[in-house]
């Protein structure tokens, strides 16, 4: 159960003070500090766990990835988990801590010295999410190590959105991921389905920009479920 996962980490993964990053083991549930308004807007760390639900890695912090807290867990229960350090097992790049990537199921350093321009990319993923399965097929894609020094511009190959410049996100394009523009008002968006895997999204769109959400276009309400058009609209 979720509680047993939380409790099993109760001693070794106490949250750090003031929201600082901590060296969690990869399986730890994120213990996130919050802001307590009654006490004068001060940060307060809380010693019990605060699971943070997510559907994709982008909803989590830079030192986290999104996954089920238990092996083979319910697809509808995914939370932000602490990233995996070097030499830890992985299934996709986002599982590895910044400065590392997933190669042959292990987190390895992406430093220039170690990086050889080859990344293993697992492509069998949930619809709109970045949750690979162990039986995924692997493709190889070439990536310039230069991207680790400057923020990627539109079309640059990336591993995660933090590799991309402001206003861009890292999204799948064929078998690799590239920096694409965050969607603007009126642009067509992908409404992520509630539960379960719905195949591979080969051309992944970015999320809607700030103050926008992905909703059914007004004049498409009568259309059938499969043909409904979603666009980025003001809240």
């Amino acid at each position: 159960t979720l509680n047993s996962v939380l409790n099993s980490n109760a001693i070794k993964n106490l949250p750090p003070p003031l929201g600082g990053a901590a060296g969690h083991p990869g399986s730890a549930v994120s213990a996130a500090p919050g802001i307590l308004y009654p006490g004068g807007n001060k940060y307060q760390t809380i010693d019990n766990y605060q699971p943070y639900p997510c559907a994709e890695d982008e909803e989590c912090g830079t030192d986290e990835y999104c996954a089920s807290p238990t092996r083979g867990g319910d697809a509808g229960v995914q939370i932000c988990l602490a990233c995996r350090k070097r030499r830890k097992r992985c299934m996709r790049h986002a599982m590895c801590c910044p400065g590392n990537y997933c190669k042959n199921g292990i987190c390895v350093s992406s430093d220039q010295n170690h990086f050889r321009g080859e990344i293993e990319e697992t492509i069998t993923e949930s619809f709109g999410n970045d949750h690979s399965t162990l039986d995924g097929y692997s493709r190889r894609t070439t990536l310039s190590s230069k991207m680790y020094h400057t923020k990627g511009q539109e079309g640059s190959v990336c591993l995660r959105s933090s590799d991309c410049a402001s206003g861009l996100c890292c999204a799948r394009h064929f078998w690799s991921k590239i920096c694409k523009p965050v969607l603007k008002e009126g642009q067509v968006c992908t409404k992520h389905r509630r539960k379960g895997s719905h195949g591979l999204e080969i051309f992944q769109r970015c999320y809607c920009g700030e103050g926008l959400s992905c909703r059914i276009q007004k004049d498409h309400h009568q259309a059938s479920n499969s043909s409904r058009l979603h666009t980025c609209q003001r809240h």
């Epitope: 559907a55 909803e59 999410n129 933090s162």
Partner: nanobody, 124 residues
Framework: EVQLVESGGGLVQPGGSLRLSCAAS????????MGWFRQAPGKEREFVAA????????VYADSVKGRFTISADNSKNTAYLQMNSLKPEDTAVYYC?????????????????WGQGTLVTVSS
């Protein structure tokens, strides 16, 4: 800054139901979760339930699973907690929490902002 206002708390008999609401304002980040936590007298604050921004992932504490349902209305920036089959041990101050996972804002870890809390008393 984020402001969270809870409502719907009150006195209810065991077996009864309540629906808590949480209105959030000042949320500027693109992707957020909303959650509920509670603190009983003399106890630590504990996690109750949370839902991610798209509704694709919901998480519940074992103690409320099957009895409580969390939902959210993105267009209104409002979260709800439907509490059924209430027990005396559910008596607590219930806090709404708005999360900022915010990878695109460079946060190393997802985190929550807290509301002031609303009291729920389950007693006959």
């Amino acid at each position: 800054e984020v402001q969270l206002v809870e409502s719907g708390g009150g006195l209810v008999q065991p077996g009864g139901s309540l629906r808590l609401s949480c209105a959030a304002s000042g949320i500027t980040f693109k992707r957020y979760a909303m959650g509920w936590f509670r603190q009983a007298p003399g106890k630590e604050r504990e996690f109750v339930a949370a839902i991610n921004w798209s509704g694709a992932s919901t998480v519940y504490a074992d103690s409320v699973k099957g009895r409580f349902t969390i939902s959210a209305d993105n267009s209104k920036n409002t979260a709800y907690l439907q509490m059924n089959s209430l027990k005396p041990e559910d008596t607590a101050v219930y806090y709404c929490a708005a999360g900022n996972g915010g990878r695109q804002y460079g946060h190393s870890r997802a985190r929550y902002d807290w509301g002031q809390g609303t009291l729920v008393t389950v007693s006959s």
